[in-house]
Amino acid sequence: MLSHTGPSRFALFLLCSMETLLSSHMAPTHQLPPSDVRKIILELQPLSRGLLEDYQKKETGVPESNRTLLLCLTSDSQPPRLNSSAILPYFRAIRPLSDKNIIDKIIEQLDKLKFQHEPETEISVPADTFECKSFILTILQQFSACLESVFKSLNSGPQ
């Protein structure tokens, strides 16, 4: 649902995301199986969709930012997984400026998918109000698209 970008940029976004490698080659002590990842994605989808739809209703006419790229997939596994450590800082950053209750639920789910001991980068939200709104919209749109992509890949496996 990337209304201002068209399919070509979304394809580029996915390709770039797939290039993202984990900062550590060390396997985590506990990693969830596809069945549990699927459960978490199923929980995240309505939260993400609802957050995006509410934001779009509230902030009509805000364009998507072309400066923000959420590198949300890891390329270390098949099917691709959500790169929780890359996504979490964005949601922590936009939390004070959006629906805290829903974002807390999203953060709680993303934490379960996070690779242990993986560092999170710090994200700063644009100071300009309009740019800030555009930044938030972009995060929410790209996250929704990312969930859709991961869910499709989990479903297209040998299930």
Epitope: T29, H30, K39
Partner: antibody, heavy 118, light 111 residues
Framework: EVQLQESGPSLVKPSQTLSLTCSVT????????WNWIRKFPGNELEYMGY???????YYNPSLKSRFSITRDTSKNQYYLQLNSVTTEDTATYYC????????????WGQGTSVTVSS | DIVLTQSPASLAVSLGQRATISCRAS??????????MHWYQQKPGQPPKLLIY???NLESGIPARFSGSGSRTDFTLTINPVEADDIATYYC?????????FGGGTKLEIK
């Protein structure tokens, strides 16, 4: 201690709908995942599906669209509904909890035996 | 779906001896060194009871006579020494992929 208890009819006629209830005590169905499993007369166990703490459901594709799980959080109960039953649905039906990601189904109900026959 | 094949279908063991039950998965059930294979014991008229989770972890309250091992596609449940109370059917179950599946069961009897 967590306890689950299945209830419902022991005899159902072919083509009718089977409805079962799982009553949970000692835990809230608004946390974890709540499952249905059945055991056929030949001892084969089949995983049927779950309803999650938020009400999201998953159904085993083998059951096609005959099967649904609902819940009533105020009663701390969840329900199985299986439409258009045949004699092949004769089984013992269990409800079970999946409490933690990466774990297993740790608490089970005693099971309720259901026969489909005219 | 992942198919779990248990062997043998039935097993007769003398009291005090070792019982070994095998479970083979049609594909790997491992993720990052964790095997999402579990073992249950079921006695007549009772529900399945969790014995071992994630291939080798003993569920609390289960005697240390029970142990699990294996990875990827090949798993083993060992009972050593077997006691009279262990007469039951044992099932493996994978939670790696949806839909979750069970093995066909192994019936343990005493010689």
């Amino acid at each position: 201690e967590v306890q689950l208890q299945e209830s419902g009819p022991s005899l159902v006629k072919p083509s009718q709908t089977l409805s079962l209830t799982c009553s949970v005590t000692g835990d809230s169905i608004t946390s974890g995942y709540w499952n249905w499993i059945r055991k056929f007369p030949g001892n084969e166990l089949e995983y049927m599906g779950y309803i999650s703490y938020s009400g999201i459901t998953y159904y085993n594709p083998s059951l096609k669209s005959r099967f649904s799980i609902t819940r009533d959080t105020s009663k701390n109960q969840y329900y199985l509904q299986l439409n258009s039953v045949t004699t092949e649905d004769t089984a013992t039906y269990y409800c079970a909890r999946y409490g933690n990601y990466g774990y297993a189904m740790d608490y089970w109900g005693q099971g309720t035996s259901v026969t489909v026959s005219s | 779906d992942i198919v779990l094949t248990q062997s043998p279908a039935s097993l007769a063991v003398s009291l005090g001896q070792r019982a070994t039950i095998s479970c083979r998965a049609s594909e790997s059930v491992d993720t990052y060194g964790n095997s999402f294979m579990h073992w249950y014991q079921q006695k007549p008229g009772q529900p399945p009871k969790l014995l071992i989770y994630r291939a080798s972890n003993l569920e609390s309250g289960i005697p240390a006579r029970f142990s699990g091992s294996g990875s990827r596609t090949d798993f083993t449940l060992t009972i050593n020494p077997v006691e009279a109370d262990d007469i039951a059917t044992y099932y493996c179950q994978q939670s790696y992929e949806d839909p979750w599946t069970f093995g066909g069961g192994t019936k343990l009897e005493i010689k």
